[in-house]
């Protein structure tokens, strides 16, 4: 059974992940990002189901495409460092989902824009955090 310290650690990691995802969303969904209209033509794959930490496998598999799209947005008005940011997210995701369990991600039929994709995973983090508190 999870101890209170492990639950606290999970909660902190989820909060960190949530902040990173929100930072990306705020960074791209900004009139100072003239590349947004181009970024929206890229599609992302959404999880069929995202209710448990193991479902973060679906996020992990989309991190490389996310980094590629974020690279488009780099400019003097846009201060995200895609490689560092995605690397940090990857570390958190690996810790949260655990590396010992092999979970095959199932994707929904409908794809999503980068904004819809980020909102989906932000909602996921908020939902899991609320069950831990």
């Amino acid at each position: 059974a999870p101890t209170s310290s492990s639950t606290k650690k999970t909660q902190l990691q989820l909060e960190h992940l949530l902040l990173d995802l929100q930072m990306i969303l705020n960074g791209i969904n900004n009139y100072k990002n003239p590349k947004l209209t181009r970024m929206l033509t890229f599609k992302f794959y959404m999880p069929k189901k995202a209710t448990e930490l193991k479902h973060l496998q679906c996020l992990e598999e989309e991190l490389k495409p996310l980094e590629e799209v974020l690279n488009l947005a780099q400019s003097k008005n846009f201060h995200l460092r895609p490689r560092d940011l995605i690397s940090n997210i990857n570390v958190i995701v690996l810790e949260l989902k655990g590396s010992e369990t092999t979970f095959m991600c199932e994707y929904a039929d409908e794809t999503a824009t980068i904004v819809e994709f980020l909102n989906r995973w932000i909602t996921f983090c908020q939902s899991i955090i609320s069950t831990l508190t």
């Epitope: 969904n29 009139y31 990002n33 003239p34 590349k35 947004l36 209209t37 181009r38 970024m39 929206l40 033509t41 890229f42 599609k43 495409p65 799209v69 488009l72 409908e110 794809t111 824009t113 904004v115």
Partner: antibody
Framework: EVQLVQSGAEVKKPGASVKVSCKAS????????ISWVRQAPGQGLEWMGW????????NYAQKLQGRVTMTTDTSTSTAYMELRSLRSDDTAVYYC??????????????????WGQGTLVTVSS | SYELTQPPSVSVSPGQTARITCSGD??????AYWYQQKSGQAPVMVIY???KRPPGIPERFSGSSSGTMATLTITGAQVEDEADYYC???????????FGGGTKLTVL
């Protein structure tokens, strides 16, 4: 109501230039880009390029690079497309079209596009 | 330069299902958009982001995408659906847009 109104038909000689205008109304001009698309008689649609009305950034189709220039005048909410060194195969209907997406993602009208009525440019000696 | 490939023509009888395909190497990661163009008119978008339908477009129009292929489906095609259909997308970098060659749909 969003409208894009283009300038009238033009007849030009080979080697000349043409400048087509596209006046936008019914929305915040600088929140969207404008694409230009042409269609030769009996042919398909050809994307020519795009300009951001926000900052003037442009992307042009490779085959037209060097011959086409797209500009905007934000004071009159007008986009312009100039094509130089005209050839007979530039004879086409030229359309301007508002970008599908706004710079502000949550602008509810963002994803539904609007096109001008088209401008016929005839290149003939 | 990036290309989108469509069949030149598709024919169906009224009430049948018409499927128009569009293939392009970047489509696994780039959305497809579909335009209908009737003779002498400006194009009208019937599907955006692979499968979404703009307001005012009949429910019989639907879109899907799998791998390098996007598909426009007209379920129960009607005579007024006779038109040229173009897929549209961008290259893998997102800057260069391109239309497919177009498909003439005949409903007879």
């Amino acid at each position: 109501e969003v409208q894009l109104v283009q300038s009238g038909a033009e007849v030009k000689k080979p080697g000349a230039s043409v400048k087509v205008s596209c006046k936008a109304s019914g929305y915040t001009f600088t929140s969207y880009g404008i694409s230009w698309v042409r269609q030769a008689p009996g042919q398909g649609l050809e994307w020519m390029g795009w300009i951001s009305a926000y900052n003037g950034n442009t992307n042009y189709a490779q085959k037209l690079q060097g011959r086409v220039t797209m500009t905007t005048d934000t004071s009159t909410s007008t986009a312009y497309m100039e094509l130089r060194s005209l050839r007979s195969d530039d004879t086409a209907v030229y359309y301007c079209a508002r970008d599908l997406y706004s710079l502000y993602y949550y602008d509810s009208s963002g994803k539904f596009d609007y096109w001008g009525q088209g401008t016929l440019v005839t290149v003939s000696s | 330069s990036y290309e989108l490939t469509q069949p030149p023509s598709v024919s169906v009888s009224p009430g049948q299902t018409a499927r128009i395909t569009c293939s392009g190497d970047a489509l696994p990661r780039k959305f497809a958009y579909w335009y209908q163009q009737k003779s002498g008119q400006a194009p009208v978008m019937v599907i955006y982001e692979d499968s979404k339908r703009p307001p005012g477009i009949p429910e019989r129009f639907s879109g899907s995408s799998s791998g390098t292929m996007a598909t426009l489906t007209i379920t129960g095609a009607q005579v007024e659906d006779e038109a040229d259909y173009y897929c549209y997308s961008t290259d893998s970098g997102g800057d260069v847009s391109v239309f497919g060659g177009g498909t003439k749909l005949t409903v007879l």
